[in-house]
């Protein structure tokens, strides 16, 4: 029950973080004007990875695409691949954690495939997470460093009387949705790995040896776990003890009188 | 159809405070801005100040101690006030409405204010 | 506050000549973010409220006349009105539309022999 119930929020907490990825990489305002310390202007200026936008007080908002893609920084090409490479990875986890819920029955796929596909998805959702974080950081960076830089020359005089106004840039709310969207697809994917680690416990090494008890029929078959779907032809609800560990993950079985090693 | 209309007391005593409403119809006042410009006879634009749509107000410098601009967004209303009114606040006062490039679009009629006694 | 600074003060002009009037502003009023000057021109006829000609410095507003144009960038501008007519007789006015206070310029008055 723990397992599943690990493995569920995992899923739901990644596709939580992959819905905020894709937020933060469609999202305009990666950076946004800096009005500390500035002089007030009737006009508001924020850019995303993909246009630049203008919100003039009256109420027009004016946006313009990167229609180029030689002519932009290297770092902010970087910082797409980032975040694209995240929405995909985290896409593709989702995908394979979907097949992978315990919850959900595909055929007979056994326990064993559903680990390993759980652990995939789960390996994917922590790269996909740390894509997005990365981007979200290198950007920030970069706009830390542009900042000062135009701190150090706020003012640009011109002839010693004309002053230009120059624009410095913040943090905007897609830096900080995308790394709280990261941070949930990493925890996402932990989540998993952990689900993983349930779903296809350890064998252990002692043989197999079945007792009879006089009057109970309760088989003991150590180190006897086979992975399988919760979902078999056989689902009575007969208990069975693996080496002492009881798990609810495993396919019943009736013992017979053949059942001796 | 978009109009501004402004409405005031014609005549007020030194010292005393100006009231000045702008009624507008054809926008919203939510969404858009009304700014208010006045104009000395004989002489040029003075701008006064701003309330955009978000409530938001700017005032000119020189003139922001005496100066006050509310809006009722349900009557379609914009108030200025000037208190401390001096024989040099006379003037035609304008309600106009910014558009692209916050450039004011539209503009009412002016209602013309004498500071005397 | 930026001080926006109009000459001539005013133009003597024949119908039919080219005139031009200047505006400078004492700070840059070009937008780095999408590259527009917020330079705003009026007219205003006797007895009229004004009336909008040109924003972001050269954009003609719907229903002016192709014979206004206005030009430049930064901190100077110019209206330039290419053959003028009878009714252009106004004083025209600039404004900072940029940074507040949004000051006008103290107009240029056009005038007919």
């Known amino acids: 029950m723990a397992v599943t119930a690990c493995q569920g929020l995992g899923f739901v907490v990644s596709l939580i973080g992959i819905a905020g990825i894709i937020a933060a990489t469609c999202m305009d305002q990666w950076s946004t004007q800096d009005l500390y310390n500035n002089p007030v202007t009737a006009v508001f200026n924020y850019q995303g990875l993909w246009r630049s936008c203008v919100r003039e007080s009256s109420g027009f908002t004016e946006c313009r695409g990167y229609f180029t893609l030689l002519g932009l920084p290297a770092m902010l090409q970087a910082v797409r691949a980032l975040m694209i490479v995240g929405i995909v990875l985290g896409a593709i986890g989702l995908l394979v954690s979907i097949f992978a819920l315990k919850c959900i029955r595909i055929g007979s796929m056994e326990d064993s495939a559903k680990a390993n596909m759980t652990l995939t998805s789960g390996i994917m959702f922590i790269v996909s997470g740390l894509c997005a974080i990365a981007g979200v950081s290198v950007f920030a960076n970069m706009l830390v460093t542009n900042f000062w830089m135009s701190t150090a020359n706020m003012y640009t005089g011109m002839g010693g009387m004309v002053q230009t106004v120059q624009t410095r840039y913040t943090f905007g709310a897609a830096l900080f949705v995308g790394w709280v969207a990261g941070g949930l697809t990493l925890i996402g994917g932990v989540m998993m790995c952990i689900a993983c680690r349930g779903l296809a416990p350890e064998e252990t090494n002692y043989k197999a040896v079945s007792y009879h008890a006089s009057g109970h029929s309760v088989a003991y078959k150590p180190g006897g776990f086979k992975a399988s779907t919760g979902f078999g032809s056989n689902t009575k609800n007969k208990k069975i003890y693996d080496g002492g560990a009881r798990t609810e993950d495993e396919v019943q079985s009736y013992p017979s009188k053949h059942d001796y090693v | 159809q978009v109009q501004l209309k402004e409405s005031g007391p014609g005549l007020v005593a030194p010292s005393q405070s100006l009231a000045i409403t702008c009624t507008v119809s054809g926008f919203s006042l939510t969404t858009y801005g009304v700014s208010w410009v006045r104009q000395p006879p004989g002489k040029g634009l003075e701008w006064l100040g701003v309330?955009?749509?978000?409530?938001?107000?700017h005032y000119h410098s020189a003139l922001i101690s005496r100066l006050s601009i509310r809006k009722d967004n349900s009557k379609s209303q914009v108030f200025l006030k000037v208190n401390s009114l001096q024989t040099d606040d006379t003037a035609t006062y304008y309600c106009?409405?910014?558009?692209?490039?916050?450039?004011?679009?539209?503009w009412g009629q002016g209602t013309s204010v004498t500071v005397s006694s | 506050d930026i001080v926006m600074t109009q000459s001539p003060s005013s133009l003597t002009v024949t119908a039919g000549e080219k005139v031009t009037m200047s505006c400078k502003s004492s700070q840059s009023l070009l937008n780095s973010g999408n590259q527009k000057n917020y330079l705003t021109w009026y007219q205003q006829k006797p007895g009229q409220s004004p009336k909008l000609l040109i924003y972001?410095?050269?954009t003609r507003e719907s229903g002016v006349p192709d014979r206004f144009t206005g030009s430049g960038s930064g901190t100077d501008f110019t209206l330039t009105i290419s053959s003028v007519q009878a009714e252009d007789l106004a004083v025209y006015y600039c404004q900072n539309d940029y940074i507040y206070p949004l000051t006008f310029g103290g107009g240029t008055t056009l005038e007919l022999k």
């Open positions: 309330i955009w749509g978000d409530g938001s107000t």
């Open positions: 972001w410095a050269s």
């Open positions: 106009g409405k910014p558009g692209r490039g916050n450039a004011m679009d539209y």
